[in-house]
Amino acid sequence: TQHGIRLPLRSGLGGAPLGLRLPRETDEEPEEPGRRGSFVEMVDNLRGKSGQGYYVEMTVGSPPQTLNILVDTGSSNFAVGAAPHPFLHRYYQRQLSSTYRDLRKGVYVPYTQGKWEGELGTDLVSIPHGPNVTVRANIAAITESDKFFINGSNWEGILGLAYAEIARPDDSLEPFFDSLVKQTHVPNLFSLQLCGAGFPLNQSEVLASVGGSMIIGGIDHSLYTGSLWYTPIRREWYYEVIIVRVEINGQDLKMDCKEYNYDKSIVDSGTTNLRLPKKVFEAAVKSIKAASSTEKFPDGFWLGEQLVCWQAGTTPWNIFPVISLYLMGEVTNQSFRITILPQQYLRPVEDVATSQDDCYKFAISQSSTGTVMGAVIMEGFYVVFDRARKRIGFAVSACHVHDEFRTAAVEGPFVTLDMEDCGYNIPQTDESTLMT
């Protein structure tokens, strides 16, 4: 998004770890109702891979029609393919559902990449490997789309888990999760563990592989190690957070922290990459290039266009730096950091010509709509979307890909001053993101 005005940027914001221990909430605190530690029936209910999205099985209509639905925390519509399409094996057939109700209203949704159009209605919806409830939810029946469905992705719809403010056609269309919480006793919280494979998966492997877990209504302690650290949800539209500092291999990027959140920073399971504002991207790439300078990579690699390949099993992970994002903590002047490895930001892809090699794409890219913490970030962590307490929790994922020398990390507390000033006050518009 282009904005004519940029707010004056603040400088001199400290974000250095001072070794000072600040009070924090840990997972030892008394658990709230519904936050029991085990949700066996929901564990491993996601499939997919970071490049094409993670999906959960859902049923719609009466009798139930089973569909695979992309889990997207960067949008707020529940929308399913409802007409034949070359990339869809199945689709929602409204005429076969006795409980379908037509809302007699159209909807059009453009994403960063891809668009769809459809007709609004409501129907009964449930999640077989989720809470044992059925809810009447708004459904957009997708009748037309362009660059939206992905060939071979195995999903037929999208579950927008963000807030009503960004729902289309407007915020009066109640999102699925709001309907779920309103109509049942499910607590207002969900958590995601996205498990990157660490190697490319072919179609049959994706179908057989476990992609992770969406725990609806709670937190499963088996899905993470260490403590959960929470950052406030700045505003309930996207899952907007505030980044206060960025380090590459422990080296501060030393930018005004407002740049990191220009024009927002969001947690988005429906985007593949870690996307960074132009200035931040340029600084980060410069720093990552410098850190990995023992090998030379073509410019196209850093632009995410070209693959780099190594002989199977010889990827030099150690030459690539770790990346740390410091997030605003729950306590004044307190932050914590999440650290990802190259195993997260180098995305494995199949190279047909050299199937013996391990090939990767650089999964950090430039954004004109702020920072997007997409699947490559989320694959390192168990992420708790605690809507009830307006916060997002991060802990090291029990399934993240790492090596014997380094692991993803969530660490704190760190003293960081003036964190509120890191937020950018965006002129009001609405956008949606998806798998870019």
Partner: antibody
Framework: EVQLQQSGAELVKPGASVKLSCTAS????????IHWMKQRTEQGLEWIGK????????TYDPKFQGKATITADTSSNTAYLQLSSLTSEDTAVYYC??????????WGQGTTLTVSS | DIQMTQSPLSLPVSLGDQASISCRSS???????????LHWFLQKPGQSPKLLIS???NRFSGVPDRFSSSGSGTDFTLKITRVEAEDLGIYFC?????????FGGGTKLELK
């Protein structure tokens, strides 16, 4: 309010090229498609082609391939139609049109192009 | 290319009359997704065309309910139940099922 503001009338010589513009307000062109139509007096409407400004992908009526080039600049929220090797056959009113995947919902006011020596 | 043929070429009416315009396509307009992308536009003198109806029968927002349209495959009809002065102009049918998109030659609705 959604509007498509087209550039002013053009009088150009045969053989020359011209670039017509269409500036959008009230929406982002990257969220829609922009089409160009040609209307000659007593000749009805012809679809020239369209662009998806989100990625620059274009589709043309084969009969306008080589004659027309559609581009878009998302930073200025403007779409363009360039017409080359102009002849009197190109004299017409040209419209830019916004569409979703289905609805051709907003039309520009039209630009009159006259090709004459 | 799909040929779109409209009839009549001109339709003289009195205010309050019912008017009916036909549009025929040289090939079926049913898309592989099952939908039919046949649309109607009205161009008033000195103005740009405006969308009236999309996908055979869906009235665009703000279009009065005296406009209706029906049809399938290759044969379509636009009906205006009680013609008002603001309805006068040239009506075009158009298809966007097949590329290139094509328009009918137009039907001029005018006063008798």
């Amino acid at each position: 309010e959604v509007q498509l503001q087209q550039s002013g009338a053009e009088l150009v010589k045969p053989g020359a090229s011209v670039k017509l513009s269409c500036t959008a307000s009230g929406f982002k062109i990257k969220d829609y498609y922009i089409h160009w139509m040609k209307q000659r007096t007593e000749q009805g409407l012809e679809w020239i082609g369209k662009i998806d400004p989100a990625d620059g992908e274009t589709t043309y009526d084969p009969k306008f391939q080589g004659k027309a080039t559609i581009t878009a600049d998302t930073s200025s929220n403007t779409a363009y139609l360039q017409l080359s090797s102009l002849t009197s056959e190109d004299t017409a009113v040209y419209y830019c049109v916004r569409s979703t995947l289905v609805l051709f919902d907003y039309w520009g006011q039209g630009t009159t192009l006259t090709v004459s020596s | 290319d799909i040929q779109m043929t409209q009839s009549p070429l001109s339709l003289p009416v009195s205010l309050g009359d019912q008017a009916s315009i036909s549009c025929r396509s040289s090939q079926s307009l049913v898309h592989s997704n099952g939908y039919t992308y046949l649309h109607w536009f009205l161009q008033k003198p000195g103005q740009s065309p405006k969308l009236l109806i999309s996908k055979v029968s869906n009235r665009f927002s703000g279009v009065p309910d005296r406009f209706s349209s029906s049809g399938s495959g290759t044969d379509f009809t636009l009906k205006i139940t009680r013609v008002e002065a603001e309805d006068l102009g040239i009506y075009f049918c158009s298809q966007s099922t097949h590329v290139p998109y094509t328009f009918g030659g137009g039907t001029k609705l005018e006063l008798k």
